[in-house]
Interface confidence: medium
């Protein structure tokens, strides 16, 4: 019968060539009677064997990425009769693995959105890297995640590539942030390789700042003979948010006098001071009203940020005209 | 510090002319209506005249309108009351005071120069 | 225009006393529009109370305004030396209008 152990070739050997092992028939009594041949994908040129004693060796550098088996078939023959001592049989050769090949980020570019204020712990995303080389030979293809740049806003999980927040940001002061993710095989030991991804992370915003005046005073004037619904100017307020968030709505806090109202253009965020009723130069020629801004929409675990309304003082001086 | 200190009183005939300046220090003067305000000797207090902060308004007492300009020179931190065709019920101390942001009262007022018309 | 009137013309008072001075107006003023100043002898006024009855910065407490549309009051709770001075009313709404003062003297 036949007798060999399992073969094994270590890939990117960089010999002309390399013993592998030996196909022998017990039969054989080392007179140099039979003649061993190699058949199958590879025999003759990736793997030769030597006739007379059954030494196989591998005569070209190996890729296990590339193929990582063999499956030849082995025949002797009596030199004398020409006949087969052995029936033909089929042998594999495995290509063993060494880490040559770095850890890969297959999906970037990666890119989440997370909404600004998130707690530490927040999940953000997961980053995923491949390695090429044999995930059960050894630590070749262990993978170990670090993170080279976002540090304190970011961490990532060693073994699961999760990046969480680990400090509360905040949209108004950075709204986007670059990641960089190391992933390590050979669970960062000695003779380790390394790849590399970027994240971009955007923060979402979140309505944690209120409408404030742009001015503490505004002065306006109103002619007398002004109808009541005339428009007799505009005051603003600016928000740090974005979109929704910064819809805000004026109105009237304070007018003794009940002359004035407030209304809110929704397209450029202004208010409009509007005459209720005519003024009279005669029996009052100056007003002064207070006016507050809020924002349109707060959710209720964000009202801690919108305490207090701002508020601007308006002082309007009534324009005299000549009566007949 | 904060202060308002009136200077240009003296004594004039009627029907002349006199200019009164007011120099603001410590604050910033550029964002206040300013006022002058006067007082005949032994009697109340009346307002004379007003400058909105950015000299774009001005408004005066009945007993002054066109015979008395206010103005202001904000690069300067100064504000002026130039007097002309005076009269003998001119006569009084002369105060500049500044407005409030927040209302048209007087929270503060310069030591006051007199102003005497006699012929 | 608003005509401003104080009550009394002098009031005689010792130190420690409670002052009480009455501004009454032609026609009704909003409390926002009134104010109070103390001038003492060779001074200029002085802001004690606005908007009827806020005390103005650094006015010690024993001040205190109030009122309402056509009656105010200013009302000083118990008399200082340095309190002994002339004190007007001013209305505010329409132009600036100032009552002739109210004496607070030395009994």
């Known amino acids: 019968g036949w007798v060999w152990n399992q073969f094994f070739v270590p890939e990117e050997m960089n010999t002309t060539s390399h013993h592998i092992g030996q196909l022998r028939s017990d039969l054989d009594n080392g007179n140099n009677s039979f003649q061993y041949k190699l058949l199958g994908a590879g025999a003759g040129s990736t793997f030769i064997i030597d006739e007379r004693t059954g030494d196989i060796y591998a005569i070209q550098k190996l890729d296990r990425e590339e193929r990582s088996l063999y499956i030849l078939r082995a025949q002797v023959i009596d030199i004398a009769t020409g006949r087969a001592v052995e029936p033909e049989s089929e042998f594999v050769i495995k290509v063993s693995d060494i880490n040559d090949n770095e850890p890969k980020f297959l999906d970037e570019p990666y890119e989440a959105i997370v909404p600004e204020m998130s707690p530490e712990g927040t999940l953000v995303i997961q980053v995923t890297a491949s390695d090429a080389d044999d995930p059960s030979s050894g630590n070749n293809a262990r993978l170990l995640y670090s993170l080279l740049q976002g540090q304190p806003y970011f961490s990532v999980e060693p073994t699961t590539g999760v990046i969480r927040i680990s400090s509360k940001m905040d949209r108004e002061l950075q709204d986007e942030y670059w990641v960089i993710i190391q992933a390590k095989d050979m669970i960062g030991q000695p003779g380790a390789l390394s790849g590399t991804t970027s994240v971009l992370i955007k923060l979402s915003d979140v309505n944690d700042n209120k409408p404030i005046f742009k001015e503490s005073l505004y002065r306006l004037t109103v002619s007398e003979s002004a109808p009541t619904g005339t428009s007799i100017g505009t005051i603003m307020a600016y928000d740090n948010d974005i979109g929704e968030n910064a819809e805000m709505d004026y109105s009237i806090e304070e007018d003794d006098s009940q002359t004035f109202d407030i209304i809110t253009n929704h397209e450029t965020q202004e208010g409009i001071v509007i005459l209720k009723k005519k003024v009279d130069f005669e029996h009052q020629n100056h007003y002064g009203i207070r006016a507050k801004v809020k924002n349109h929409h707060v959710p209720e675990q964000l009202m801690k940020y919108h305490t207090e309304a701002s508020t601007t003082f308006i002082k309007i001086q009534v324009e005299d005209v000549d009566e007949p | 510090q904060v202060q308002l200190v009136e200077s240009g009183g003296g004594v004039v005939q009627p029907g002349g002319s006199l200019r009164l300046s007011c120099a603001a220090s410590?604050?910033?003067?550029?964002?206040?209506?300013m006022d002058w305000v006067r007082q005949a000797p032994g009697k109340g207090l009346e307002w004379v005249a007003v400058?909105?902060?950015?000299?774009?308004?001005?408004y005066y007492a009945d007993s002054v309108r066109g015979r008395f300009t206010i103005s202001r020179d904000n690069s300067k931190n100064t504000l002026f009351l130039q007097m002309n065709s005076l009269r003998v019920e001119d006569t009084a101390v002369y105060y500049c005071?500044?407005?409030?942001?927040?209302?048209?009262?007087?929270?503060?007022w310069g030591q006051g120069t007199l102003v005497t018309v006699s012929s | 225009e608003i005509v401003l009137t104080q009550s009394p013309g002098t009031l005689s008072l010792s130190p420690g006393e409670r002052a009480t001075l009455s501004c009454r107006a032609s026609q009704s003023v909003s409390s926002s529009y009134l104010a109070w100043y103390q001038q003492r002898p060779g001074q200029a006024p002085r802001l004690l109370i606005y908007?009827?009855?806020s005390r103005a910065t650094g006015i010690p407490d024993r001040f205190s305004g109030s009122g309402s549309g056509t009656d105010f009051t200013l009302t000083i709770s118990s008399l200082e030396p340095e309190d002994f001075a002339v004190y007007y009313c001013?209305?505010?709404?329409?132009?600036?209008?100032f009552g002739q003062g109210t004496k607070v003297e030395i009994k």
């Open positions: 908007g009827a009855s």
């Open positions: 005071a500044r407005e409030t942001g927040e209302g048209w009262y007087f929270d503060l």
């Open positions: 400058i909105w902060y950015d000299g774009s308004n001005k």
């Open positions: 001013q209305q505010y709404g329409s132009s600036w209008t």
């Open positions: 410590g604050f910033s003067f550029s964002s206040y209506d």
